[in-house]
């Protein structure tokens, strides 16, 4: 097991998850750790505890390894980091990778007020409701680099979007969470259409998908859930 020393001088590895950092309960996920060609061992940590290791075969001469989680559960959802060893030296820690398990317990209802098709500049609010009590709700938009909004609530949360722009168009889902990394089943999708403005036409996503495997998003974890912070939470963490 890796020992913290002043010798940790190797550059930090890159960590990412495939097919997604959001994994349905019971499904598998691959965590990749990319270090150096010369790495003799990679170690994966989960919530600060040693989780797994891999010693690459010299014949393969690869600078990355894959850690396979065969069945994602609430016990394997959380923060992962990885390290690698080359010679006597250990690398710095990778950036944290946050894995979320979805498909737990219940399915929320999502609806939009006043309606799913609105005029440019109109005020829009999303509502998410879950019968079983939860601590926090998340609203996600499919595709693109989009912020997650979150709101604390018992069985319902509202997400005011303000006056909508074309950037708001797209397909949304919501989740209830039992902690930050254990989420409910996703709601049915709600597609927000924007009409009016220069291009007087209904604008829907060019490539809609209901698969969470293709979502990319930011994570906003402020108390109100209305402001957005800059913490980027994507498939790959490497800064």
């Amino acid at each position: 097991q890796r020992i913290n020393t002043e010798k940790e001088t190797l550059p930090k590895p890159i960590i990412w998850a495939k097919p997604s950092i959001m994994v349905t309960n019971g499904n598998s996920v691959n965590i990749w750790c990319q270090g150096a060609q010369s790495a003799s061992e990679y170690q994966l940590y989960f919530e600060g505890s040693f989780f797994a290791l891999e010693r690459p075969k010299p014949s393969r001469s690869m600078n990355k390894v894959r850690f396979f989680i065969s069945q994602m559960t609430s016990h394997t959802a959380g923060i992962y980091t990885c390290f690698y060893q080359s010679g006597e030296l250990w690398s710095k820690s990778s950036n944290p990778l946050k894995l979320v398990v979805t498909g737990l317990y219940d399915t929320p209802n999502l609806w939009v007020y006043p309606r799913p098709e609105v005029t440019l500049g109109e005020n829009v609010t999303f509502f998410c409701q879950l019968k079983t009590a939860t601590s926090k709700f998340f609203l996600l938009k499919e595709r693109g680099s989009n912020h997650i909004q979150n709101k604390y609530g018992n069985i319902q949360a509202e997400f005011p979007m303000g006056p909508v722009t074309r950037a708001h168009r797209g397909t949304y889902r919501c989740f209830g969470s039992y902690n930050d990394y254990a989420w409910s089943f996703p709601s049915e999708p709600v597609t927000l259409l924007i009409t009016g403005g220069v291009e007087n036409s209904s604008l829907a996503p060019t490539d809609p998908t209901s698969s969470l495997d293709y979502w990319e998003f930011d994570l906003s974890t402020n108390e109100s859930g209305l402001q957005k912070d800059s913490a980027f939470w994507d498939h790959t963490t490497q800064n």
Epitope: F46, F51, A52, E54, T76
Partner: nanobody
Framework: EVQLVESGGGEVQPGGSLRLSCAAS????????MGWFRQAPGKEREFVAA???????YYAESVKGRFTISRDNAKNTLYLQMSSLRAEDTAVYYC????????????????????WGQGTLVTVKP
């Protein structure tokens, strides 16, 4: 569905040896990563040793040099050879599997394992 059945536990004197076996049902054994964990009375379950599907191994510091993990894919069986046993090795020993797995992964954390045996008791006392 994988079933794991441990055997070989018993009472032994300090300095003695035991070999634990874990028989796995099904045809997935060769593609599984395997591990041994133990739980002493009043304590949390702890990692002992693990082996990848390509026979790479890893040991807890407390057993390194005394315990040896191995597998026989033809017999669908995992082994733990324990020698120089100490009183602090007294525990229920559990066999666990990650099915399926990939490459040379060795799993140390109990959360990684998706199949568990019922355990076999090892008692070390004079």
């Amino acid at each position: 569905e994988v079933q794991l059945v441990e055997s070989g536990g018993g009472e032994v004197q300090p300095g003695g040896s035991l070999r634990l076996s874990c028989a796995a049902s099904g045809r997935t054994f060769a593609s599984a990563a395997m591990g041994w964990f133990r739980q002493a009375p009043g304590k949390e379950r702890e990692f002992v040793a693990a082996i990848s599907r390509s026979d790479d191994t890893y040991y807890a510091e407390s057993v390194k040099g005394r315990f040896t993990i191995s597998r026989d894919n033809a017999k669908n069986t995992l082994y733990l050879q324990m020698s120089s046993l100490r009183a602090e090795d007294t525990a229920v020993y559990y066999c666990a599997a990650v099915v399926p797995t990939y490459g040379n992964n060795i799993y140390v954390h109990s959360a990684a394992y998706n199949y568990w045996g019922q355990g076999t008791l090892v008692t070390v006392k004079p």
